[in-house]
């Protein structure tokens, strides 16, 4: 009954692990979508908004076929860490205007943090090589105006939405290969 002492514990089914990661990612995608709607409603901003410090989108969903799980998880984790930093910056740097997006923005930050921990766990369960700790990123520049901060918020939430959408599709596709 049970494995002999000293033998490795059977690791959980990686497909189940991936499933729970997809669920968390989907949930965060929905949070981001709702917050983006709220932002557009309260602070309309025409056109696309960019922020140089944001990661570029990993790639189109169509190009996912060629990807391998390790590279997807590694890239996703790096991008989401950047978005976490940007959300933290947004919450602290912005004055009264964006304070009206609380507590939703705080909840988004907490869930993004949770997803990152889940990705870290998944990578260790799949025995993927652990990345060295990221070098400290340069501090994000203060917004030059409230309007600049609002545009940054649009860019951050819009970019996070695209990244999470890409992540859900990619993880689901890669699950079929496990």
């Amino acid at each position: 009954p049970g494995p002999p002492p000293g033998s490795p514990r059977a690791s959980p089914d990686p497909r189940a692990e991936l499933d729970s990661t997809v669920l968390l990612t989907r949930s965060l995608l929905e949070d981001t979508r709702q917050l983006t709607i709220q932002l557009k409603d309260k602070f309309p901003a025409d056109g696309d908004h960019n922020l140089d410090s944001l990661p570029t989108l990993a790639m189109s969903a169509g190009a996912l076929g060629a990807l391998q799980l390790p590279s997807v998880l590694t890239r996703l984790r790096a991008d989401l860490l950047s978005y976490l930093r940007h959300v933290q910056w947004l919450r602290r740097a912005m004055g009264s205007s964006l304070k009206t997006l609380e507590p939703e923005l705080g909840t988004l930050q907490t869930r993004l943090d949770r997803l990152l921990r889940r990705l870290q766990l998944l990578m260790s369960r799949l025995a993927l090589p652990q990345l060295p700790p990221d070098p400290p990123a340069p501090p994000l520049a203060p917004p030059s105006s409230t309007w600049g901060g609002i545009r940054a918020a649009h860019a951050i939430l819009g970019g996070l939405h695209l990244t999470l959408d890409w992540a859900v599709r990619g993880l689901l596709l890669l699950k079929t290969r496990l």
Epitope: M94, G95, K99
Partner: antibody, heavy 117, light 111 residues
Framework: QVQLVESGGGVVQPGRSLRLSCAAS????????MHWVRQAPGKGLEWVAV????????FYADSVKGRFTISRDNSKNTLYLQMNSLRAEDTAVYYC??????????WGQGTLVTVSS | QSVLTQPPSASGTPGQRVTISCSGS????????VNWYQQLPGTAPKLLIY???LRPSGVPDRFSGSKSGTSASLAISGLRSEDEADYYC???????????FGGGTKLTVLG
């Protein structure tokens, strides 16, 4: 260069009203949240109210809630503070201040409001 | 009673280094950026430090800010007579939905 000039201060009796104005120039007024901060004679700074760049969001200090109203006219580059039911403890120099986010980068020179019978 | 706590006074001689502390809570300093303002006698306040530790252009590098947890501090090195002023710390407070200030610290340059 950025300039903020307050006006409208003066001596007023308790219970009466007063409207302060802050004329802004040298920057795109409609891109910035704006605040009012006051300082009673010989005392420290006290935050009063803030209005968002578009005028849609407003927050007030508990001490003035229900009595003071902050507003702005972006077409006139002007910030206002309507002060009703004034009390002796509202006596102070009132400053308007610009914020690009979490700090006040420019302040006006202030206008003195004295509430006295 | 101010939400942020500062010592009412501080002093030093020219050339010395002085530090002014500012203590708050998790809803203000702990979760938002700290700013410092200098108010020379008879004038409007002026931004000295923002974003915890950044200096606006024109502010000498003798002035520096730092933050740890729910406390912040302003350090002034190479003290000069023109530094004699009131210094205020400030931050947004999430619980109060507004800006809070410290009570102010009157800095005296001796001699």
């Amino acid at each position: 260069q950025v300039q903020l000039v307050e006006s409208g201060g003066g001596v007023v009796q308790p219970g009466r009203s007063l409207r302060l104005s802050c004329a802004a120039s040298g920057f795109t007024f409609s891109h910035y949240d704006m605040h009012w901060v006051r300082q009673a004679p010989g005392k420290g700074l006290e935050w009063v109210a803030v209005i968002s760049y578009s005028g849609s969001v407003k927050f007030y200090a508990d001490s003035v809630k229900g009595r003071f109203t902050i507003s702005r006219d972006n077409s006139k580059n002007t910030l206002y503070l309507q002060m009703n039911s004034l009390r002796a403890e509202d006596t102070a120099v009132y400053y308007c201040a610009r914020t690009p986010g979490s700090h006040f980068d420019y302040w006006g020179q202030g206008t003195l409001v004295t509430v006295s019978s | 009673q101010s939400v942020l706590t500062q010592p009412p006074s501080a002093s030093g001689t020219p050339g010395q280094r002085v530090t002014i502390s500012c203590s708050g809570s998790s809803s203000n300093i702990g979760s938002n950026y700290v700013n410092w303002y200098q108010q020379l006698p008879g004038t409007a306040p002026k931004l000295l430090i923002y974003y915890d530790d950044l200096r606006p252009s024109g502010v000498p590098d003798r002035f520096s800010g730092s933050k740890s947890g729910t406390s912040a501090s302003l350090a002034i090195s190479g003290l000069r007579s023109e530094d004699e002023a009131d210094y205020y710390c400030s931050a947004w407070d999430d619980s109060l939905s507004g800006v809070v200030f410290g009570g102010g610290t009157k800095l005296t340059v001796l001699g």
